[in-house]
């Protein structure tokens, strides 16, 4: 399809390394939430870090290929990774413009689906990227 | 600084494969970019052929995709353009091109092919 | 596609003129209010050189006598006052949808 896909583009502090490059930054006039216009897909993706009390967004922009998933309408986060004990990380892609916004819903922490509370450990710059 | 040179045949028959190198110096395709490639008939207007990306994914304009296939060889910092089926039509100076963004900040100095029996 | 037409095609014009070269999409160029059009000069034997970005953005190393502006389907390049090294061909080319499209030129000549 020939018309480019938006996507809201956040990045929290600390986290390493930027989808940055995948999209053109858009001006839309307000400070948050930023938009970016995607160059090489069609599909948004949103990671959210979800603890005990509350989901964090960590990372939103455009993916850098278009894959299973992206054909999805709506942001509906799996479980990928613990950053940390007590945390989840917890991805989505979607091919709708700004469908990253918000997720349509997350499971709480320990339900069935999500990783083991054994499951991949990881530093948290680098827990990132195993979620992407 | 980021420079591209293209190579290859300047000549080529009708119904052959036109095949274009272009060398990237001063930087690594793997990093970032698109990379691009743009055709000029002679005399004529300019246009987008496709590209790959960074990451090794292609986009190809429609009315060439059935006969154009851009990859790379990252080893030696190059991507190529292959083009099927030539016909006259399809003679015109070949650019290579670097985006970062959706316009073309670096350019190739061109190579003239003619498709000629 | 989105075809761009450029106009005028070519034109005769004495240095220290003011040009105005106009690019019309056949559709908007525009998402969410920014404008993927982009300007480019050619000199014969050479390659297209970046003028402006995204409608009005000046290219790093372009002189201030180049300008853009518009948005939608109707945009301008203006040389506020034409030197002997701005004679060339002047083309457009939006990136708002695939397959990038390009402008059939503009050839400013020498009066």
């Known amino acids: 399809p020939p018309n480019r896909r938006t996507c809201v583009f956040f990045e929290a502090p600390g986290v390493r390394g930027s989808t940055k490059t995948l999209g053109e930054l858009l001006d839309t006039g307000t400070e948050l939430p930023r938009a970016i216009r995607c160059l090489y897909s069609r599909c948004c993706f949103g990671i959210w870090n979800l603890t005990q009390d509350r989901a964090q967004v960590e990372m939103q922009g455009c993916r850098d290929s278009d894959e299973p998933g992206c054909e999805s309408l709506h942001c509906d986060p799996s479980p990928r990774a613990h950053p940390s004990p007590g945390s989840t990380l917890f991805t989505c892609s979607c091919g709708t413009d700004f469908c990253n916004a918000n997720y349509s819903h997350l499971p709480p922490p320990g339900s069935p689906g999500t990783p083991g509370s054994q499951g991949p450990q990881a530093a948290p710059g680098e827990s990132i990227w195993m979620a992407l | 600084q980021l420079q591209l040179q293209e190579s290859g045949p300047g000549l080529v028959k009708p119904s052959e494969t036109l095949s274009l190198t272009c060398t990237v110096s001063?930087?690594?395709?793997?990093?970032?970019?698109?990379w691009n490639w743009i055709r000029q008939p002679p005399g004529k207007g300019l246009e987008w052929m496709g590209y790959?990306?960074?990451?090794?994914?292609?986009s190809y304009n429609p009315s060439l995709k059935s006969r154009v296939t851009i990859s790379r060889d990252t080893s030696k910092n190059q991507f190529s353009l292959k083009l099927s089926s030539v016909t006259a039509a399809d003679t015109a100076v070949y650019y290579c091109?670097?985006?970062?963004?959706?316009?073309?900040?670096?350019w190739g100095q061109g190579t003239l092919v003619t498709v000629s029996s | 596609d989105i075809q761009m037409t450029q106009s005028p095609s070519s034109l005769s014009a004495s240095v220290g003129d003011r040009v105005t070269i106009t690019c019309r999409a056949s559709e908007s160029v525009d998402t969410y209010g920014n404008s993927f059009m982009h300007w480019y000069q050619q000199k014969p034997g050479k390659a297209p050189k970046l003028l402006i970005y995204?409608?009005?953005n000046l290219e790093s190393g372009v002189p201030s006598r180049f300008s853009g502006s518009g948005s939608g389907t109707d945009f301008t390049l203006t040389i506020s006052s034409l030197q002997p090294e701005d004679f060339a061909t002047y083309y457009c080319q939006q990136s708002n949808e695939d397959p990038y499209t390009f402008g059939g030129g503009t050839k400013v000549e020498i009066k």
């Open positions: 790959i990306s960074f990451s090794g994914s292609t």
């Open positions: 001063g930087y690594s395709i793997t990093s970032d970019f698109a």
């Open positions: 091109a670097g985006s970062r963004y959706s316009w073309f900040a670096y």
């Open positions: 995204r409608a009005s």
